[in-house]
């Protein structure tokens, strides 16, 4: 998971809306694993912004040491700064905790750019604005890092919420959420509402602002509108899903759907952008350029490098298309689509022009490791990570940024055949090579 910008074929597939409406599972099933309704104590417990990550306050050790921790569904280690670093205001001091236990084992996590390394241990952990429980969890005490912590981000560690298979140094290191569910009565489910501001926030505004909610153990109805639609978790490592069709302003990209998931598609709160496989990225950008052709932008903008600015309040949202991703549904031959607006994929950037300008970066980028549905996607939706039932739910977020003409949407069902063929089967090579490529 990166914290800046991270990220034999069969044709004729795809989820064209055929008019046929299949019966849809209601989202009010009695056997729902998580508590439903109101989680007042957890609402608004996240702060941050898409470009630097969303974080939750956690306490570690006895007496409790308070730290801000990045919420990352694209990794599986709970790792915290445990030594002085120029970008950290505070760090975990193991020697001050009476409940710290050293596991006498090191951990090293390299990324395409940057890395962190540290020492493994366990300690007591709680989430003040979360469930009223304390758990003993594995902690990687980060002693050295390079290009990992972000200056001004205000977080000091990372909470990897994915599965044990991608934990470091190996899958025997139990992730935090597994420990939480095992040691308490918290249901095996969490949900995220990431709220993009729609405008740049300076440091003090981020500290004062609400960034969203992480509801641990359930679903809060106040955080979304409409219905929740679920897609199966294909495999429990990353939160892997299957995309069956992609549309730009309703126009099908018409690619073999395997391309959309080459070599995987994941939901990752620790990545800023919507990252797409090379072929898909090129087709998508070509289509977005064509849709917005009344204005031209330099190549550096489409590469996510240059910013484009408009006079404050004059951003021409209407010239940019909506993007729809069709996801495999829970019912055979049924899919649903999630649609994001330019308000999600044009990311506001601060401190570059004058206050009379609104400036943006293009937040869709190329990936060599598959599709990554990062913060720009998640900011449009309330996303339910229903681990108990091996599925991920999407509903329109109550806090998503939109205008008077268009809104993000979650719609279905659509008839889509042969969706299983859209998944890519990664050749079983040394697993360690799969998890370091975070380009």
């Amino acid at each position: 998971t990166q914290h800046g910008i991270r990220l034999p074929l069969r044709s004729g597939l795809g989820g064209a809306p055929l008019g046929l409406r299949l019966p849809r599972e209601t989202d009010e099933e009695p056997e729902e694993p998580g508590r439903r309704g109101s989680f007042v104590e957890m609402v608004d417990n996240l702060r941050g912004k898409s470009g630097q990550g969303y974080y939750v306050e956690m306490t570690v050790g006895s007496p409790p040491q308070t730290l801000n921790i990045l919420v990352d569904t694209g990794s599986s280690n709970f790792a915290v700064g445990a030594a002085p670093h120029p970008f950290l205001h505070r760090y975990y001091q193991r020697q001050l905790s009476s409940t710290y236990r050293d596991l006498r084992k090191g951990v090293y996590v390299p990324y395409t750019q940057g890395k962190w390394e540290g020492e493994l241990g366990t300690d007591l952990v709680s989430i003040p604005h979360g469930p009223n429980v304390t758990v003993r969890a594995n902690i990687a005490a980060i002693t050295e890092s390079d290009k990992f912590f972000i200056n001004g981000s205000n977080w000091e560690g990372i909470l990897g919420l994915a599965y044990a298979e991608i934990a470091r140094p190996d899958d025997s290191l139990e992730p935090f959420f597994d420990s939480l569910v095992k040691q308490t009565h918290v249901p095996n489910l969490f949900s995220l509402q990431l709220c993009g501001a729609g405008f740049p926030l300076n440091q003090s505004e981020v500290l004062a602002s609400v960034g969203g909610s992480m509801i641990i153990g359930g679903i809060d109805h106040s955080l979304y509108t409409g219905s929740l639609w679920y897609t199966p978790i294909r495999r429990e490592w990353y939160y892997e899903v299957i995309i069956v069709r992609v549309e730009i302003n309703g126009q099908d990209l018409k690619m073999d759907c395997k391309e959309y998931n080459y070599d995987k598609s994941i939901v990752d709160s620790g990545t800023t952008n919507l990252r797409l496989p090379k072929k898909v990225f090129e087709a998508a950008v070509k289509s977005i350029k064509a849709a917005s052709s009344t204005e031209k932008f330099p190549d550096g903008f489409w590469l996510g490098e240059q910013l484009v600015c408009w006079q404050a309040g004059t951003t021409p949202w209407n010239i940019f298309p909506v993007i729809s991703l069709y996801l495999m549904g829970e019912v055979t031959n049924q899919s649903f689509r999630i649609t994001i607006l330019p308000q999600q994929y044009l990311r506001p950037v601060e401190d570059v022009a004058t206050s009379q300008d609104d400036c943006y970066k293009f937040a869709i980028s190329q990936s060599s490791t598959g599709t990554v549905m990062g913060a720009v996607i998640m900011e449009g939706f309330y996303v339910v990570f229903d681990r108990a039932r091996k599925r991920i739910g999407f509903a329109v977020s109550a806090c998503h940024v939109h205008d008077e003409f268009r809104t993000a949407a979650v719609e279905g069902p659509f008839v889509t055949l042969d969706m299983e063929d859209c998944g890519y089967n990664i050749p079983q090579t040394d697993e360690s090579t799969l998890m370091t490529g975070r380009a």
Epitope: T294, E295, K296, P298, G300, A353
Partner: antibody, heavy 120, light 108 residues
């Protein structure tokens, strides 16, 4: 070979509107490869970007000029124009029209410039 | 706002000498920077784009380097026609709007 030529009055009274035209010769203003822009330079001072236009009519303006600027294009005449309203002596400058090339990034071809003096 | 600061304001050199001009951005502009030359009574001329690429027809004695916040224009051996004012411009923020204040290269 493509050339740009500014034209318009060299003297404008305070509070009036400055109007300049840039004629493109040796090539089409309707090329999808370029934006067209205006830059000015007060006597003895540095360069200040005023704004750009694409042949479709899409415009970008310098916010510091506070809504006084209008740039328009006439593809049939292969021209684009600048209007700057409510001028003061501070608007006295050499006004250049230029082509924004190299992937819409750099002013790679300039007109000779025309001096506009704001004075009563 | 990104501010471009050029130094020195004036550089006094003799023909044949090496000229080194600096442009510093108040924050990173990646490699999205250009250099222009302006002679008295003339329009500016694009010399270098994308920090280090020479524009069409620009002699090899002109070279640009740098990325991020610090950029340099080097004229390896000054010719008489090189005495002029040089401006840098960033296009990291688009449309391109910010010019540096200029460096005057004068005959010593």
């Amino acid at each position: 070979q493509l050339q740009l030529q500014e034209s318009g009055p060299g003297l404008v009274k305070p509070s009036e509107t400055l109007s300049l035209t840039c004629t493109v010769s040796g090539g089409s203003i309707s090329s999808s490869s370029y934006y067209w822009g205006w830059i000015r330079q007060p006597p003895g001072k540095g360069l200040e970007w005023i704004g750009n236009i694409y042949y479709s009519g899409s415009t970008y303006y310098n916010p510091s000029l506070k809504g006084r600027v209008t740039i328009s294009v006439d593809t049939s005449k292969n021209q684009f124009s600048l209007k700057l309203s409510s001028v003061t002596a501070a608007d006295t400058a050499v006004y250049y029209c230029a082509r924004l090339g190299h992937g819409y990034n750099y002013f790679d071809l300039w007109g000779r410039g025309t001096l506009v003096t704001v004075s009563s | 706002e990104i501010v471009l600061t050029q130094s020195p304001a004036t550089l006094s050199l003799s023909p044949g000498e090496r000229a080194t001009l600096s442009c510093r951005a108040s924050q990173s502009v990646s490699s999205y920077l250009a250099w222009f030359q302006q002679k008295p009574g003339q329009a500016p001329r694009l010399l270098i784009y994308d920090a280090s690429n020479r524009a069409t027809g620009i002699p090899a004695r002109f070279s640009g380097s740098g990325s991020g916040t610090d950029f340099t224009l080097t004229i390896s051996s000054l010719e008489p026609e090189d005495f002029a004012v040089y401006y840098c411009q960033q296009v990291y923020v688009w449309p391109p709007r910010t010019f540096g204040g200029g460096t005057k290269v004068e005959i010593k």
